[in-house]
């Protein structure tokens, strides 16, 4: 008894595909090991079709794919655009060689059947549109019209010229004749469901002179397309149900049992599971229309439902396309925190993955806001601007060849909580989804700057403290200038570390930053913060101001624009953060589309890109003390 | 509210042939796998075999004990299937069980694999 166990026998039909799944006892050795799929020859000899050591025969070439499921110790084989040659005996197995641990399949592919020459074979997609033509002679012009439906030797009357229609097909048969035709009726049946399936007979008249016509109609359920995805990475679910239903309102839904539970639909309904990681974009005008999840887990796995119906449920009779997920737990894409937490005045530093093969990619981070079908717009990115209420307090940090770059924000409020993206315009499977939450703070920030309203004068000397804690001791601090595009590190120096490595004096560890002489372009937002290598952490901002020598008004009040910082209510805070909405940049759509539709997915560039490293003084009139 | 009734249960020779049915009632959607198992006396619940519906393909799995004696059939427009049983051995005896899933997730081997089941009909093989 072999301890591989599939299917024995499958059938299909021309065209068609089959998915079959080999089921393998679950060791390690199983698990890593050569899984094959191969023909059995009369010779007795199994020749290797596809295997998963990345061998794909010529005739599988462009229609099959195996893949290896471990954590269900199971691995699929897929067949596309079967013919009746593909017809025999297989074997899917386990082994270095093609003899190891297997199971024998029988698959049969059979021609599409088919009927006696007058019959009009008629297919079509469950919740579609069928139109039967009737034809029928110039003596029957004038007698009764009807479409009857096959039952055993029965045949009921569907719909009649005298304007019957069976009650199971009420308000979704018509029969009309087209223009001045004198020798064709029509009868249309909308909203198809599996028991309209079956053969109906059309008749023009009665007795020995009636004309009949012979149609199969064959209401396909949808054939799941299978989708392939890693933990963690992303899912796009395209949907295209056609222009009848372009108007109406659109949902995905997960099959649960006899039911399909909407995840979202354009009526604002969606689960919380998906809460913060899900996004429904209308393509065009026509009714097709995408869902995108990101952060999958295993848990997602399964089948999928996209449709349309006014009520935004699933309903009978209407169009839907289907699809099969399975979540690969073997994934390239790293564990990251899903939750960062952060307090109010304090920072949080949001470390994104990106598939390290793409190191040049841009990076962006958006705010997924739940409103309607969800949207997500960037807020930074490494062609983009930082937009409006995040000036001075987001910054995103490129480290080329790490696989991750970093995002900071600080000066946080409550408003600051929810769902963020980061995503690159590079491998879309690589968007990572994280919470944040910012509870109100309760002890003194660990960073803090003095003065702390700031303003320096042209021409003068200006330096500038942060004072942090011994916890701090042994981290990189530093001073860096945010601009729109970064936030570019200065000179600066840290007098903590004068003191010896044994002893901390907590009143005395400081990080200063000196501008000498001070420039008109030195106003701005400066941040004092600490790392360790390329791993960031908190920051603290501060506003300077430059005044003229002569005058005594300053550019800018630097108490209104720390407080922003420091102590201000929150809804002075939020006041003076957010502006207007009508600038938000939308994310580009294009970075949600298949990966060939990505090009220039940072409009909003400015000519020259962030730094990654924000390294240089450049321009800058800092000094070293 | 769903009701999977399995008919075709009786009494026969070793040797013999036996066909069992099973129907869906109280469903909306087409299932996509239908299974048997049997219980013997004492015993716990076994897989004898399932058929499985995706899109125009079918699949059909069988227990190792009854390959090749066995044959399983169904139409899921109808939610029907069909257990041909011949060669009936006395290791076939147990009340024979009708399952069935609107999905074809997990291993078909295991009861978990299934949401509804039938009440059971009995086959006894006598010598």
């Known amino acids: 008894q072999s301890p591989i166990f599939g299917p024995q026998d499958v059938s299909s039909i021309e065209g068609n595909s089959v998915s079959i799944t080999c089921y393998y006892p679950d060791t390690s050795v199983n698990r890593h090991t050569r899984k094959y799929w191969c023909r059995q020859g009369a010779n007795g000899y199994c020749a290797t079709l596809i295997s998963s050591n990345g061998y794909l025969s010529k005739e599988y070439s462009g229609r099959a794919s195996l893949i290896n499921f471990p954590e269900n110790s199971t691995f699929v084989i897929n067949i596309a655009h079967l013919t009746q040659e593909d017809t025999g005996s297989y074997k899917c197995g386990l082994g270095t060689t093609n003899r190891g641990l297997f199971f024998d399949v029988s698959l049969e592919v059979s021609q599409v059947p088919e009927f006696p020459n007058d019959t009009h074979v008629y297919t079509k997609d469950i919740g579609r549109t069928v139109t039967i033509e009737c034809r029928f002679k110039e003596g029957n012009a004038h007698s009764k019209k009807s479409l009857c439906k096959k039952r055993g030797e029965a045949c009921e009357v569907v719909i009649d010229s005298t304007e019957y229609v069976d009650p199971s097909y009420k308000d979704r048969a018509i029969l009309f004749m087209k223009g001045t035709s004198r020798d064709i009726f029509y009868v249309n049946i909308s909203h198809l469901i599996p028991s309209d399936a079956g053969l109906y007979v059309c008749q023009a008249g009665e007795g020995p002179s009636a004309d009949k016509n012979n149609a199969d109609l064959q209401v396909l359920e949808p054939e799941p397309e299978l989708l392939y995805k890693d933990l963690r990475s992303s899912v796009t679910f395209e949907c295209d149900l056609g222009r009848e239903v372009a108007n109406d309102a659109k949902y995905l839904c997960r099959k649960n049992k006899e039911t399909c539970d909407v995840i979202i639909n354009t009526l604002g309904k969606r689960d919380p599971a998906f809460e913060g990681r899900i996004l429904l974009t209308p393509r065009d005008d026509n009714g097709r229309f995408s869902v995108l999840i990101t952060g999958l887990r295993k848990e997602d796995a399964g089948h999928y439902q996209c449709g349309a119906h006014s009520s935004g449920l699933p309903q009978e009779g209407w169009p839907v396309q289907a699809w099969q997920l399975f979540v690969n737990e073997e994934s390239t894409i790293p564990n990251s925190r899903s939750v960062v937490k952060g307090v109010t005045g304090g920072s949080v530093a949001i470390v994104c993955p990106y598939n390290p093969k793409e190191s040049s990619s841009l990076k962006y981070w958006c705010h997924w806001e739940a409103d309607e079908n969800g949207r997500c717009p960037v807020l930074v990115g490494t062609q983009a601007l930082v937009q409006e209420g995040y000036e001075g307090r987001l910054a995103l940090f490129d480290q080329p060849g790490s696989g991750a770059y970093t995002v900071i924000l600080n000066q946080l409020t409550t408003q600051d909580s929810g769902f963020y993206w980061c995503l690159t315009d590079g491998d879309s499977r690589w968007r990572t989804t994280i919470e944040l939450q910012v509870a109100e703070a309760t002890k003194k920030p660990d960073l803090e700057v003095t003065p702390q309203n700031a303003t320096a004068v042209i021409g003068e000397t200006f330096t500038i403290s942060c004072h942090y804690p011994c916890k701090f001791y042994s981290q990189e601090k530093y001073w860096c200038k945010w601009s729109n595009d970064g936030c570019h590190i200065l000179p600066s120096h840290d007098e903590g570390a004068r003191q010896s490595s044994v002893s901390c004096d907590q009143s005395s560890q400081i990080v200063s930053m000196t501008l000498n002489p001070v420039k008109k372009e030195d106003e701005g937002w400066y941040w004092c913060g600490v790392k360790e290598g390329q791993v960031y952490g908190e920051t603290t901002a501060i506003y300077v101001a430059v005044e003229e020598r002569t005058r005594g008004s300053p550019h800018i009040n630097p108490t209104d624009a720390n407080a922003r910082a420091k102590d201000a209510p929150e809804e002075e805070a939020m006041e003076s953060s957010v502006r207007e909405d009508e600038n938000k940049a939308n994310l580009d759509p294009r970075l949600f589309a298949d990966e060939r539709e990505i090009q220039n997915a940072g409009d909003q560039a400015q000519e020259n890109r962030a730094s990654g490293n924000a390294g240089s003084a450049g321009g800058q009139s800092g000094s070293s003390k | 509210e769903v009701q999977l009734v399995e008919s075709g249960g009786g009494v026969v020779q070793a040797e013999d042939s036996l066909r069992l049915s099973c129907a869906a009632s109280?469903?909306?959607?087409?299932?996509?796998?239908m299974g048997w198992f049997r219980q013997a006396p004492g015993k716990e619940r076994e897989f004898v075999a399932t058929?499985?519906?995706?899109?125009?393909?079918?699949?059909?799995y069988y227990d190792d004990s009854v390959k090749g004696r066995f044959a399983v059939s169904g139409d899921n427009t109808k939610n029907t299937m069909n257990l041909q049983m011949k060669g009936l051995n006395l290791e076939d005896t147990g009340v024979y069980y009708c399952?069935?899933?609107?999905?074809?997730?997990?291993?078909?081997?295991?009861?978990?694999?299934?949401?509804?089941w039938g009440q059971g009909t009995q086959v006894t093989v006598s010598s």
């Open positions: 058929i499985e519906w995706s899109g125009r393909s079918t699949y059909k």
């Open positions: 399952a069935a899933n609107p999905n074809n997730y997990g291993d078909p081997r295991t009861p978990g694999a299934y949401q509804y």
């Open positions: 109280g469903l909306s959607f087409s299932l996509s796998r």
